[in-house]
C-alpha cells in the first residue's frame, strides 16, 4: 500500500523518465546557483513537500538529492538564515519502512543525522545546521537541482 506522497513521487519520476533525452547541461541556467557539478535553485516561497516535488519537475529538475555528508555541508553553507528550512528529495516510505530518495534509492544511515521521527507522511528538510523530519504537509521552502554534465576530454589513440 503506497501513500499518496509515494504515488506522487513515483508518478513524477515516471513522467520524467518518459520525456525525450535532452542534451547535457554544461552551464547553469539563469537563476540557478552552481555548486560543484550541480545547479541549485532555492525557493523564496513555501509549499508542502509534494507541491515542491512537482514544482521542481516542471523545471525539468528534481528536489535536491544529497550524496553524502560532504555535499550536505556544502549545500548548508549556501543557507544564510538559521531559522529557514528547505525540503529535499527524501521522504519516508511506509511500504519499505525506510527513508527513500525520490530516485528510488534508500538512505545510507551514515549520510544524514536526522532529527525527528521516521514515520508515515514524514519528509526531510535541511537547515543551515541540521537535517529534520517534518510532516510532509508543512509549508516550507525547497531546493531543486539539475545535474551538470561533466566535460570529458576526448582521448585519441596514437596515430
Amino acid at each position: 500500500q503506497k501513500s499518496s506522497i509515494e504515488k506522487c513521487s513515483v508518478d513524477i519520476q515516471q513522467s520524467r523518465n518518459k520525456t525525450t533525452e535532452r542534451p547535457g547541461l554544461l552551464n547553469c541556467p539563469i537563476y540557478w546557483q552552481q555548486l560543484r557539478e550541480k545547479c541549485l535553485l532555492f525557493s523564496h516561497t513555501v509549499n508542502p513537500w509534494n507541491n515542491s516535488l512537482a514544482d521542481c519537475s516542471t523545471k525539468e529538475s528534481s528536489l535536491l538529492l544529497i550524496r553524502d555528508k560532504d555535499e550536505l555541508i556544502h549545500t548548508q553553507n549556501l543557507i544564510r538564515d538559521k531559522a529557514i528550512l528547505f525540503w529535499i528529495g527524501l521522504n519516508f516510505s511506509l511500504s519499505e519502512k525506510n527513508w527513500k530518495w525520490i530516485n528510488g534509492s534508500f538512505l545510507n544511515s551514515n549520510d544524514l543525522e536526522i532529527r525527528g521521527d521516521a514515520k508515515e507522511n514524514s519528509c526531510i528538510s535541511i537547515s543551515q545546521t541540521s537535517v529534520y523530519s517534518e510532516y510532509c504537509s508543512t509549508e516550507i521552502r525547497w531546493i531543486c537541482q539539475k545535474e551538470l554534465t561533466p566535460v570529458r576530454n576526448k582521448v585519441y589513440p596514437d596515430s
Partner: antibody, heavy 121, light 108 residues
Framework: QVQLQESGPGLVKPSETLSLTCTVS????????WSWIRQPPGKGLEWIGY???????NYNPSLKSRVTMSVDTSKNQFSLKLTSVTAADTAVYYC???????????????WGQGTMVTVSS | EIVLTQSPGTLSLSPGERATLSCRAS???????LAWYQQKPGQAPRLLIY???SRATGIPDRFSGSGSGTDFTLTISRLEPEDFAVYYC?????????FGQGTRLEIK
C-alpha cells in the same frame, strides 16, 4: 510591504563611474535576485543585470565589461557601478526585486521609483 | 539573445473595448517565462502577468495573458480609462533578460 529606494548622484561626467544604491525596506533581501534596469528618455527598458543575495551575479553581455554589482545583506542594500560612462548611459535607472523562476513572485514584481542619471560635462 | 517584437506599436481604442497586444520571440522561451508590464508616464513599470498567464498580486481580472513557445498575447477584456499606458513584454527564461520595444495603448 517591501519597498525599494534608489539613491545616488543625478549627474555624472563622461568617462567617470556611475554609482547607485538600492535600499530594501519592509522585507528581507535573502533568496531573491535583485535587478537593475534602465530606460533612456523616451525609449524602452534595458536589463543591466542581477545580483543574488549570496553575491553571485549575472550581467547583460552588452554592459558586462563596465558593470559591477554588490550586495550588503546587513544593510539590506545592493549597489550598481557602471564605469566609463558616456551620454548614451543617460537614463532613468530602476532597481527591482526579481523573483526569478520560483512561482508566486516570478519576474520583477517590485520596483523602485527610479532615479534619473544624466551623463554630461 | 532572445529578441522580443511587440505589435502593434500603437493601439488606439476607446474605453470599454477589448485590447489585444502581441509579443513574438525570436526563439522559443524556456518554461513560458514571459511577463507583461504596464508603464504610465513618470512611473516605474508594474508587473501584470508572469509565467505567460499568471496574474500578479492585485491585478484586475480584465488582464489576461496567454501563449507559449514564441507567440504570446496580453488581453484587456474591457478597457478602463486607467489602462491607457505603454505595455512591455519581457522574457526571463534565458540570459540576458530582454524586453520588447513596447506597445502604446492610447485613447481613440
Amino acid at each position: 510591504q517591501v519597498q525599494l529606494q534608489e539613491s545616488g548622484p543625478g549627474l555624472v561626467k563622461p568617462s567617470e563611474t556611475l554609482s547607485l544604491t538600492c535600499t530594501v525596506s519592509g522585507g528581507s533581501i535573502s533568496y531573491y535576485y535583485w535587478s537593475w534596469i534602465r530606460q533612456p528618455p523616451g525609449k524602452g527598458l534595458e536589463w543591466i543585470g542581477y545580483i543574488y543575495f549570496s553575491g553571485s551575479t549575472n550581467y547583460n553581455p552588452s554592459l558586462k565589461s563596465r558593470v559591477t554589482m554588490s550586495v550588503d545583506t546587513s544593510k539590506n542594500q545592493f549597489s550598481l557601478k557602471l564605469t566609463s560612462v558616456t551620454a548614451a548611459d543617460t537614463a532613468v535607472y530602476y532597481c527591482a526585486r526579481d523573483g526569478g523562476i520560483v512561482g508566486a513572485t516570478e519576474a520583477f514584481d517590485i520596483w523602485g521609483q527610479g532615479t534619473m542619471v544624466t551623463v554630461s560635462s | 539573445e532572445i529578441v522580443l517584437t511587440q505589435s502593434p506599436g500603437t493601439l488606439s481604442l476607446s474605453p470599454g473595448e477589448r485590447a489585444t497586444l502581441s509579443c513574438r520571440a525570436s526563439q522559443s522561451i524556456s518554461g513560458s517565462y514571459l511577463a507583461w508590464y504596464q508603464q504610465k508616464p513618470g512611473q516605474a513599470p508594474r508587473l501584470l502577468i508572469y509565467g505567460a498567464s499568471s496574474r500578479a498580486t492585485g491585478i484586475p481580472d480584465r488582464f489576461s495573458g496567454s501563449g507559449s513557445g514564441t507567440d504570446f498575447t496580453l488581453t484587456i477584456s474591457r478597457l478602463e480609462p486607467e489602462d491607457f499606458a505603454v505595455y512591455y513584454c519581457q522574457q526571463y527564461g534565458s540570459s540576458p533578460i530582454t524586453f520588447g520595444q513596447g506597445t502604446r495603448l492610447e485613447i481613440k
